[in-house]
């Protein structure tokens, strides 16, 4: 009877050992989970499917760099610096996907692009570099192409509701589209400085028949063409003083 | 009796703690002492008094400087950057005094200076500065001195047995002296690749009259005037890999 | 510098580091762009001298002790960062540094 | 962010800062220039909730633990270096930074 | 036209270091990545490296300690560099507009260039 | 190191049939589909026919379909017609710079 109940202790031992094993593995992800999300600030994990993600996603040359700047599977994670920064995350790219605005809407209703909001977290002086990225569906044919990005302003006495932000001219050849950037630095620094003058762009991107061949609201087949703004800022976290 | 017993136990959790509290103060700062040995490299404490480090400590601007740079109480801690480097301290100035060297003999036995080793550890890429300081003993009247560095050099067939370095002229009026840098750099950095070429260095710095200046074996009154070298390194801290 | 690294099947009694990976497709997190999945790593062990730690400044002598702490113990010595890229469900993308998430060295302290 | 500071009539019973000024001449270590002092801190107090963690990669489940640690304990999450002026015993006084030589914050890890 | 051209040796003894151009046109390259791709012959496609629209390199495993891929944007000019060739390297060398595997990347090839390692 | 392993390695069928390609990867592909196929003919560089696992290349005949997602994918070329005699290749992404191209099919027409 000693030796069985011996057995069972042990037995016991092991199973203790093992549920300990799992129990303190899931509360250790679930530890670094929540930590997670306090150090990104964020509430509780953004609700977002993975469709949601695929629709969003930019398929543009920024995206790519981001995801490939560093090994996903950072199996060399010994030679990270020691922790050289504060308890929060620090942002150094932000890629802002264009919402729909009260201003930007066209004459049956149906919103236009493009209106980007910003959180009055970003400085204006931390901007190193915003490029606006727009793709330009394919051509059949040899043509050129007249890029022009438009800032929504009140309207003037005149009536003119629009100022130009940038105009370029390309050259497009028949095959897949391709993605442009636009150096906005200015503007969204001016937006940054006073909010309300950001009221929305419009695209445009006539071929020589006039038609537009900028993506603004994704077709069938366009998921993750949309415009985006692309913004590099120099994060430097605030030293926490007692 | 209860309430004695009690009264034991309170006075007796009073001097435990009080105890407690002492022991442990000692014990951190015994541990602290340790770690700071550990993180200097050094096995024990230097062995120095109080009387050598004042004839050894050189009174002259790098060292004011290098006291003055930082709040020496560090009132506010709290300011410091979180921990960026690995265990080990970082090296920023390496400030050398002369040695004795064989090579340099006088021709009545009497040491010559001055010769200066160095650790293997510098690296003669990570310099970023090598100066010599000099102490010129105080003029009666205004004069003009001539300083020469000398470097020593394996006898040529001409006989041969020094190679200038630099060489400066400068006007000095009466008072106190004057501390006096060089800068050695190239010098430095030659002695590094190749050590067996570091014989040595000769300092002059004579007046109009041919007395020299120099102080390069302090007499009475002139400690802390012997002539260093300042060294300031770049010391990126390895990372140390697993 | 010192620190002991270990795997699950160790039978180091002492403070080491272990594998930890963290999966976040495995939990659901597809807001999380980039890594999918990182190693965290994590420390476990017994803390028995005090010439053994890091950092002294949390070093307590096993005796009558006021404030229940109980003396060195198995502890991150060194970190480092992750990069991330991930929805911060505001219509954006961030891509940012998240400081402490790997633990690349234990000690005691 | 987080992390408590205290002092030594504090009657706080959580992971705490406390202050503690290392003081080299009182010990006779007239080799280290400067600093001759510096306020080194240390922490102290208890720990009880995973959630208070900044470092979530020591927590271990309070059950039965084959590696006897004893679940998250006070310990520094942000240290700071020091800058000292020393003799190193070889005709040299060296001017350099020492890492993690002051407690900036305490917290459960 | 959108065109890539690939120029550079023939042949490249052992050891020795090759450089390969990969010159466009119709092509901005501050918003195009090229890719280097090679094929040994009768063999499959190997990838070899990329350098983005932002200038950033990213090398294959087995080329990271011999590659550097850099690029002149005023020229329209992307510059391979291999050291210490062998002749394993013999192989068709392709550049590649945009990241095969990403998006729409791989639409556009040179013809390639057939670079002989021997001696 | 990724291995993204192709079967069959050769293909033999008569025009019209269906052909299945396979492309197997020893881990899964960024986001599950960064995933693309490549055509290719003796003499001539690769030709971009699917990318994004499913999606078909501008000027791409409408019998080429792509599939699959994680580290299991296919094209099907519906109804093969003679001059889709070539070598078929498939190219995966991972994140962190790592690319790979699959050894390849060579589908033959009898």
């Known amino acids: 009877e000693g030796s069985e109940r011996e057995e069972n202790v042990e037995k016991e031992g092991l199973c203790n050992a093992c549920a300990w094993r799992q129990n303190t593995r899931y509360s250790r992800i679930e530890a670094i989970k929540i930590q997670i999300l306090s150090k990104l600030r964020l509430e509780t994990a953004p609700n977002i499917s993975k469709d949601a993600i695929r629709q969003l996603l930019p398929r543009a040359p920024p995206l790519r760099e981001l995801i490939d700047q560093y090994d996903v599977q950072r199996d060399d994670s010994s030679d990270g610096s020691l922790e050289d920064d504060d308890y929060h995350a620090t942002t150094e790219t932000i890629i802002t996907m264009p919402t729909e605005s009260d201003f930007l809407m066209q004459a049956d209703g149906k919103p236009k692009c493009c209106f980007f909001k910003f959180s009055s977290k970003i400085q204006y002086n931390k901007v190193v570099k915003a490029q606006l990225w727009i793709y330009l569906r394919p051509v059949k044919t040899p043509t050129t192409v007249f890029v022009q990005i438009l800032r929504l302003i009140k309207p003037m006495k005149d009536g003119t509701r629009y100022t130009g932000i940038r105009s370029l001219k390309l050259d497009m050849s028949p095959g897949t589209g391709i993605w442009q950037s636009i150096d906005v630095k200015t503007v969204l620094q001016n937006w940054l400085k006073q909010p309300e003058s950001n009221l929305g762009i419009e695209i445009k991107a006539l071929d020589e028949n006039g038609h537009d061949l900028a993506v603004t609201f994704p077709g069938p087949g366009e998921d993750g063409l949309n415009p985006f703004l692309e913004v590099k800022v120099t994060d430097t976290p605030k030293r926490s003083r007692r | 009796e209860g309430s004695e017993r009690e009264e034991n136990v309170e006075k007796e959790g009073l001097c435990n703690a009080c105890a407690w509290r002492q022991n442990t103060r000692y014990s951190r700062i015994e541990a602290i002492k340790i770690q700071i040995l550990s993180k200097l490299r050094l096995e024990t404490a230097p062995n120095i008094s109080k009387d050598a480090i004042r004839q050894l400590l050189p009174r002259a601007p790098p060292l004011r400087e290098l006291i003055d740079q930082y709040d020496v109480q560090r009132d506010d801690s709290s300011d410091g950057s979180l921990e960026d480097d690995d265990y080990h301290a970082t090296t920023e100035t390496i400030i050398t005094m002369p040695t004795e060297s064989d090579f340099l003999m006088q021709a009545d036995g009497k040491p010559k200076c001055c010769f200066f080793k160095f650790s293997s550890k510098i690296q003669y890429n990570k310099v970023v500065k090598a100066q010599l300081w000099i102490y010129l003993r105080p003029v009666k009247t205004p004069t003009t001195v001539f300083v020469q560095i000398l470097r020593l050099i394996k006898p040529m067939k001409d006989g041969t047995r020094y190679t200038g370095i630099r060489s400066l002229k400068l006007d000095m009026s009466p008072g106190t002296g004057i501390w006096q840098s060089i800068d050695v750099k190239t010098v430095l950095q030659n002695w590094l690749k190749q050590p067996e070429s570091n014989l040595g260095i000769e300092i002059k710095a004579l007046d109009e009259n041919g007395h020299d200046l120099a102080v390069t074996f302090p007499g009475p009154g002139e400690d802390g005037l012997n002539p260093f070298l300042e060294v300031k390194v770049t010391d990126t801290p390895k990372r140390s890999r697993r | 510098d010192f620190g002991l690294d270990c795997d699950e099947h160790s039978t180091e009694s002492r403070c080491c580091r272990y594998p930890l990976t963290v999966d976040f497709e495995a939990f659901g997190w597809d807001w999380i762009i980039a890594p999918k999945r990182y190693k965290a790593n994590y420390c476990s062990g017994e803390c028995e001298f005090v010439f053994l730690q890091k950092y002294p400044h949390t070093h307590l002598v096993h005796q009558a002790n006021p404030r229940g702490s109980a003396g060195p113990c198995c502890t991150p010595t060194k970190m480092s960062p992750i990069n991330m890229l991930y929805f911060n469900g505001k219509e954006q993308i961030i891509y940012g540094k998240i400081p402490a998430m790997v633990v690349d060295r234990c000690g005691c302290s | 962010d987080f992390g408590l500071d205290c002092d030594e009539h504090s009657t706080e019973s959580r992971c705490c800062r406390y202050p503690l000024t290392v003081d080299f001449e009182a010990f006779g270590w007239d080799w280290i220039i400067a600093p001759k002092r510096y306020k080194a801190n240390y922490c102290s107090g208890e720990c009880e909730f995973v959630f208070l963690q900044k470092y979530p990669h020591t927590h271990l489940v309070h059950q039965a633990n084959p590696r006897g640690s004893a679940g998250p304990c006070c310990t520094p999450t942000k240290m700071s270096p020091i800058n000292m002026l020393y003799f190193n015993g070889k005709e040299q006084i060296i001017y350099g930074k020492i890492p993690a030589m002051v407690v900036d914050r305490c917290g459960c890890s | 036209q959108v065109t890539l051209k690939e120029s550079g040796p023939v042949l490249v003894k052992p050891t020795e270091t090759l450089t390969l151009t990969c010159t466009v046109s119709g092509i901005d390259l501050s918003h195009t990545d090229i890719s280097w791709v090679r094929q040994a012959p009768g063999k499959g496609l190997e990838w070899v490296g990329i350098?983005?629209?932002?200038?950033?390199?990213y090398y294959a495993s087995w080329a990271k300690k011999r590659l550097t891929i850099s690029k002149d944007t005023s020229k329209n000019q992307v510059v391979l560099t291999m050291t210490n060739m062998d002749p394993v390297d013999t192989a068709t060398y392709y550049c590649?507009?945009?990241?095969?595997?990403?998006?729409?990347?791989?639409?556009?090839w040179g013809q390639g260039t057939l670079v002989t390692v021997s001696s | 190191d990724i291995v993204m392993t192709q079967s069959p390695a050769t293909l033999s069928l008569s025009p019209g049939e269906r052909a299945t390609l396979s492309c197997t990867s020893s881990?899964?592909?960024?986001?599950?589909?960064?995933l693309s196929w490549f055509q290719q003919k003796p003499g001539q560089p690769p030709k971009l026919l699917i990318y994004?696992?499913?999606t078909l290349a501008y000027g791409v005949p409408s019998r080429f379909s792509g599939s699959g997602s994680g580290t299991d994918f296919t094209l099907t070329i519906s109804s093969l017609q003679p001059e889709d005699a070539a070598t078929y290749y498939c190219a995966g992404g991972y994140g962190g710079g790592r690319y790979a191209f699959g050894q390849g099919t060579k589908v033959e027409i009898k």
């Open positions: 881990q899964s592909v960024y986001h599950a589909n960064w």
């Open positions: 590649a507009r945009g990241v095969p595997a990403y998006s729409h990347g791989g639409d556009l």
């Open positions: 994004w696992a499913s």
């Open positions: 350098i983005s629209y932002a200038g950033k390199t």
